[in-house]
């Protein structure tokens, strides 16, 4: 789970070791701050939990792509 080091910066210190289906993911944000020990992706899940993931992992990249496409496609 992400940790807020102050009001403005949230960091990830550990990554999930289990892939989560994109069906269970709602959104994501990238963590690139130099104040954090590592680059990370924080997924917000359908049950509003935030989970830290490794942006180097293929499933993480695929999930971000999928969520990007979902955001770009207007819902009818």
């Amino acid at each position: 789970q992400p940790d807020a080091i102050n009001a403005a910066v949230t960091c990830c210190y550990n990554f999930t070791n289990r892939k989560i289906s994109v069906q269970r993911l709602a959104s994501y944000r990238r963590i690139t701050s130099s104040k954090c020990p590592k680059e990370a992706v924080i997924f917000k899940t359908i049950v509003a939990k935030e989970i830290c993931a490794d942006p180097k992992q293929k499933w993480v990249q695929d999930s971000m792509d999928h969520l990007d496409k979902q955001t770009q496609t207007p819902k009818t």
Epitope: R18, S21, V22, Q23, R24, T45, I46, V47, A48, K49
Partner: antibody, heavy 119, light 109 residues
Amino acid sequence: QVQLVQSGAEVKKPGSSVKVSCKASGGTFSHYGISWVRQAPGQGLEWMGGHIHIFGTANYAQKFQGRVTITADESTSTAYMELSSLRSEDTAVYYCARYDAHYGELDFWGQGTLVTVSS
Amino acid sequence: EIVLTQSPATLSLSPGERATLSCRASQHVSDAYLAWYQQKPGQAPRLLIYDASDRAEGVPARFSGSGSGTDFTLTISSLEPEDFAVYYCHQYIHLHSFTFGQGTKVEIK
């Protein structure tokens, strides 16, 4: 250690309803759900539906739609399954089982509740 | 609804033998969201394998799961007396629509 404790055996008349409870202890209720699974004598497992606590709503297998109601009381960490318009074919052991809504495998199970429908 | 078909219905083997149980899905099970359970008479099912190949806590190494897409396998490398039971597969890709296979009984030959 998570434990799910179910209510006791029930004998019901055809056409009546039954409400089975499932009390969870030793774990968080928040992003978890409870599924209800039944097993008729000598038969396999049949998923009836599930309730994810944070959503506050339930999903039901098509077969049971309109006849089953799954609810939960977060204050007491208890889930309920009510089945109405009972018939003899509903005689079965009813299990509750916990799952993490991020995944879905049923990692902890109740001991089961035998519901007998007989006139 | 994803239909899971298990085969064989019954497997008659001796202790020490290898058991191979199959579970075939009617549609692609994405993310390998498939589990295996063991059930003994009078007991609740017990989770053995999740995500097709990951062993649950406390499950002996002789149990292994494999497969993806529509074909999944549970293997018991060398049957112990306590392994004779019924085994079920379960898909959980859709939270609103879980399904189980009909079960495979592993009995003593």
